[in-house]
């Protein structure tokens, strides 16, 4: 059975700012003609054939909903892209991760301004503080770094908060195992 | 490479007013920051106050606080300077300067020559 | 009134290593990076060192710069002829919310 293909995103933030860059592209399986990729926002069909979507310049109105297809097979889950404008945004590598497996947050200025002073919130309460920026990583998510995360910092000596980010950590799936 | 070129030297009664320009060229004026820095004759470096053309702001040194303004005219690149109420000591060389796009240590990266602002009556 | 406080002067022979303190407080240099300028006589300052220890391109390696809690210090190691200038500390201030420069060391080579 061909497997759906997996729309994945560099850099691979899905909160990104207008004005900046991500490509998108349609990963799966013994795809032969790299050239015959359907893209899909908001349900609508894109111009786009190619296996990789660029994303230039990005506007507020490319935001939504992005799913790919190759061939006749079914179509990619769907990838979920938001355009802000903001001083400040908090980036996740997922906004839903299962259990065991990474999770990197980013804050991240505008127009690529150093952040600096920069406390991560999960829940209210502060996590992390470096005066130069740095990424916060978990290389292994657990049901307890599900919460509210948060970041503030100064971009030119000026205080900014970001937009609050929902983060929702799922346990894996359990294997279930059949006796013959 | 960015270059700041001031206007020309002024003469000022006490009372008045001067408006010194700081044109940029050779980069993106856009994407720093102008602050505004005086020296009086035999003096140290003193800071007055800085703009962010692209985000509109700017903010003072409380000792200047009332008596000056800075604005910036993105369309031609240039900053500018007013201060008001002038008094003797206020006889300095003003200069412009960039500071580094990257604001976190706030350096002063490129200057302007200076212009000379002498008070007399 | 300046609130980071230097040495009015400095001096020392060709070749020398010549110090330059830089005295602030927890607002200023304590939570903030140090920068350090040049002025050569008659001529604009000129920045020498940023982010505490960081020469800008074109900045000859024997100025270096350190930071340690409130203070900060510019090395001059084998001096010339063409240092002899006067060299400014600076660094954000929290509480005044704006920038602030040291007193000024005037560096003579004898």
């Known amino acids: 059975v061909p497997q759906k293909p997996k729309v994945s995103l560099n850099p691979p933030w899905n909160r990104i700012f207008k004005g900046e860059n991500v490509t998108l592209t349609c990963n799966g399986n013994n795809f032969f003609e790299v050239s015959s990729t359907k893209w899909f926002h908001n349900g609508s069909l894109s111009e786009e054939t190619n296996s990789s979507l660029n994303i230039v310049n990005a506007k507020f109105e490319d935001s939504g909903e992005y799913k790919c297809q190759h061939q006749q097979v079914n179509e990619s889950e769907p990838v979920y892209l938001e355009v802000f404008s903001d001083w400040l945004l908090l980036q996740a590598s997922a906004e839903v991760v299962m259990e065991g497996q990474p999770l990197f947050l980013r804050c991240h200025g505008w127009r690529n301004w150093d952040v600096y002073k920069v406390i991560y919130y999960k829940d209210g309460e502060a996590l992390k503080y470096w005066y130069e920026n740095h990424n916060i990583s978990i290389t292994n998510a657990t049901v307890e770094d599900s919460g509210t995360y948060y970041c503030t910092g100064k971009v030119w000596q000026l205080d900014y908060e970001s937009e609050p980010l929902n983060i929702t950590v799922i346990k894996a799936p359990r294997e279930k195992y059949w006796l013959q | 490479e960015v270059q700041l070129v001031e206007s020309g030297a002024e003469v000022k009664k006490p009372g008045s007013s001067v408006k010194v320009s700081c044109k940029a060229s050779g980069g993106t004026f856009s994407s720093y920051a102008i602050s505004w820095v005086r020296q009086a004759p035999g003096q140290g470096l003193e800071w007055m106050g800085r703009?962010?053309?692209?985000?509109?702001?700017?903010n003072y040194a409380q000792k200047f606080q009332g008596r000056v303004t800075i604005t910036a005219d993105k369309s031609t690149s240039t900053a500018y300077m007013e201060l008001s109420s002038l008094r003797s000591e206020d006889t300095a060389v003003y200069y412009c300067?960039?500071?580094?796009?990257?604001?976190?240590?706030?350096?002063?990266?490129?200057w302007g020559q200076g212009t000379t602002v002498t008070v007399s009556s | 009134q300046s609130v980071l406080t230097q040495p009015p002067s400095a001096s020392g022979t060709p070749g020398q290593r010549v110090t330059i303190s830089c005295s602030g407080s927890?607002?200023?240099?304590?939570?903030?990076?140090v920068n350090w300028y040049q002025q050569l006589p008659g001529a604009a300052p000129k920045l020498l060192i940023y982010a505490n220890i960081q020469r800008p391109s074109g900045v000859p390696d024997r100025f270096s710069g350190s930071k340690s809690g409130t203070s900060a210090s510019l090395a001059i190691s084998g001096l010339q002829s063409e240092d002899e200038a006067d060299y400014y500390c600076a660094s954000w201030d929290d509480s005044r919310n704006g920038y602030v420069f040291g007193t000024g060391t005037k560096v003579t080579v004898l």
């Open positions: 927890t607002s200023n240099i304590g939570g903030n990076s």
């Open positions: 300067a960039r500071v580094n796009p990257f604001g976190y240590y706030y350096a002063m990266d490129v």
């Open positions: 703009i962010i053309p692209i985000l509109g702001i700017a």
